[in-house]
């Protein structure tokens, strides 16, 4: 009597995550009686995965009609694959027992699932930081097998260098997770730049996944400060303006004071957008020079974005001629400033 | 349709022999395992012999030697050669097919009488 | 060879009744426990084997269960039809062997 042969043809099928899996398995003979069970995995820990004899498996069918005596085919389909399903799938042969005893198994079958990454999540600094400062941003994409997988960022469409990439775990397993951090330098003109993570993996046919991360949540743009004096009115009224530009985000607020005195606060509101992103503010101040007997030192003091104030300080000489158009007046500055600026009439 | 059809039943003598046949249709008989199975007057239910796929014989204890189990596949049919019998033996003989994995019985003959009596 | 003990040996019940009959075997017999219904005169028919598996065409009012060397059969509706004698039979090796029965006739 010839041996009993349980025969795996293949050494390994993949599917598509959602699909159906046909595992397949044919025996040489029937003979002893007993029956054939579909097991994943070897050893004391196997997990049975159907058991032609008995049992109740919703999504693993016999692929021939299992009741026909002399049928010999022991495949199975599995529906709706997911990756966990992954694994090596061995078909086995028992003889009728109490309890059954195992007579052989197949070589088994490795089954791996072929799962789309997540769409790519990129996130960026929690705090914003200001030009000429390099910050990280993350992407994380999650959920894909095989664990082959390309990831590149690009700013602005250019590919970034600076990249730190891991794919978790490092050995075998259901599904994988990427993770990936890249360093960008910002610049003053980076408001309306975007960062793009690039994720390729077999499942997506060449079509890859984007995630996205605008700079402008990352950036702080600080404001330049100009003050500077209007000719005098005839009624004995100077003009003060503080032009405060090229700041972002709009979050400002802005106050003059006179002599260390509050006179009066702003809020930045509704600005309009230049072409780089930023935004510009212009504040002005009427002083009346007769009501005051001293010079008088005029701050623009602006805060920006929760950061400590910048003030820029502005001198009215009073002795100079009502009609004068400050020709005898002088700026000063104090505070943190981008540049300097004197005073005068422009 | 699945059938089986038993024959061959009868009186007869102690010491005498009797042949009863099965006929099935609907199914190919050497396919499966095939099974005698008795059930004496007002009694239960005796298993009495069996026939494996491969030609592989069984019988219970108190019919060894005198009864033999076989098949015609030509003619899909079972058949127990029964000698040397006794009034012990006096049933309604049933053929039986195993069934599919295990050999659970699944489907019965009508079943024929066999009468041992002098 | 392994015996089987079916009880009750008879039992009394009326329409609409839910009856259990238990069989023991003396010794394990994993899940190849079998059980049959036979009307008188009539060939037996198969309704459960493996312990817990309907044969075609079985009504879902039969079901059983056990393993190893306890098994019931349990009939949940009772109809007029049902009555009759229930085997219980172990198959996992010969010779092959049966219960005595259990009789259900009508109260």
């Known amino acids: 009597e010839e041996e009993l042969q349980v025969i795996q043809p293949e050494k390994s099928v993949s599917v598509a995550a959602g699909d159906s899996a046909t595992l397949n398995c044919t025996v040489s003979s029937l003979i002893p009686v007993g029956p054939i069970q579909w097991f994943r995995g070897a050893g004391p820990g196997r997990e049975l995965i159907y058991n032609l004899k008995e049992g109740h498996f919703p999504r693993v069918t016999a692929v021939s009609d299992p009741t026909k005596r002399n049928n010999m085919d022991f495949s199975i389909r599995i529906s709706n694959i997911t990756p966990a399903d992954a694994g090596t799938y061995y078909c086995v042969k028992f003889r009728k027992g109490s309890p059954d005893v195992e007579l052989k198994s197949g070589a088994g079958t490795e089954l791996s699932v072929r799962a789309k990454p997540s769409a790519p999540v990129v996130s960026g600094p929690a705090v914003r930081a200001t030009a000429e400062h390099t910050v990280s941003f993350t992407c994380e994409s999650h959920g894909f097998s095989p664990r082959d997988i390309t990831l590149k960022w690009f700013k602005n469409g250019n590919e970034l260098s600076d990249v730190q990439t891991n794919v978790d775990p490092a050995g075998k397993s259901v599904s994988y997770s990427i993770r990936s951090t890249a360093r960008v330098l910002l610049t003053r003109r980076d408001v309306h730049s975007q960062v793009i993570c690039e994720v390729a993996h077999v499942t997506l046919q060449g079509d890859p996944l984007r995630g996205t991360a605008n700079l402008s949540e990352a950036i702080r743009v600080p404001p330049f400060l100009e003050v500077t004096q209007q000719s005098m009115r005839a009624d004995n009224q100077v003009n003060v303006t503080c032009q405060v530009t090229k700041f972002y985000p709009q979050r400002l607020q802005l106050t003059w004071l006179e002599n260390g005195n509050v006179s009066r606060t702003e809020m930045a509101s509704a600005l309009p957008e230049n072409k780089d992103g930023t935004y510009n503010w212009t504040s002005w101040l009427l002083v009346n020079v007769s009501a005051h007997r001293d010079d008088v030192k005029l701050t623009c003091q602006v805060e920006h974005d929760g950061q400590p104030a910048v003030n820029k300080s502005f001198s009215v000489k009073v002795s100079a001629h009502p009609k004068e158009q400050g020709s005898n007046t002088a700026a000063e500055n104090t505070g943190t400033n981008e540049r300097n600026i004197y005073g005068g009439s422009g | 349709e699945v059938q089986l059809v038993e024959s061959g039943g009868g009186l007869v003598q102690p010491g005498g022999s009797l042949r009863l046949s099965c006929a099935a249709s609907?199914?190919?008989?050497?396919?499966?395992?095939m099974h005698w199975v008795r059930q004496a007057p007002g009694k239960g239910l005796e298993w009495v012999s069996a026939?494996?796929?491969?030609?592989?014989?069984y019988y219970t204890g108190s019919v060894k030697g005198r009864f033999t189990i076989s098949r015609e596949n030509a003619k899909n049919s079972l058949y127990l050669q029964m000698n040397s019998l006794r009034a012990g033996d006096t049933a309604v003989y049933y053929c039986?097919?195993?069934?599919?994995?295990?050999?659970?019985?699944?489907?019965w003959g009508q079943g024929t009488m066999v009468t041992v009596s002098s | 060879d392994i015996q089987m003990t079916q009880s009750p040996s008879s039992l009394s019940a009326s329409v609409g009744d839910r009856v259990t009959i238990t069989c023991r075997a003396s010794?394990?017999?994993?899940?190849?426990a079998a059980w049959f219904q036979q009307k008188p005169g009539k060939a037996p028919k198969s309704l459960i084997y493996?312990?817990?598996s309907l044969h075609s065409g079985v009504p879902s009012k039969f079901s059983g269960s056990g393993s190893g060397t306890d098994f019931t059969l349990t009939i949940s509706s009772l109809q007029p039809e049902d009555f009759a004698t229930y085997y219980c039979?172990?198959?996992?090796?010969?010779?092959?062997?049966f219960g005595q029965g259990t009789k259900l006739e009508i109260k």
């Open positions: 039986v097919r195993g069934g599919v994995w295990d050999d659970a019985f699944d489907i």
């Open positions: 609907g199914f190919t008989l050497s396919s499966y395992d």
């Open positions: 026939i494996g796929t491969a030609g592989d014989t």
């Open positions: 010794q394990g017999i994993n899940n190849y």
């Open positions: 493996t312990a817990s």
């Open positions: 039979q172990q198959y996992v090796s010969y010779p092959y062997t």
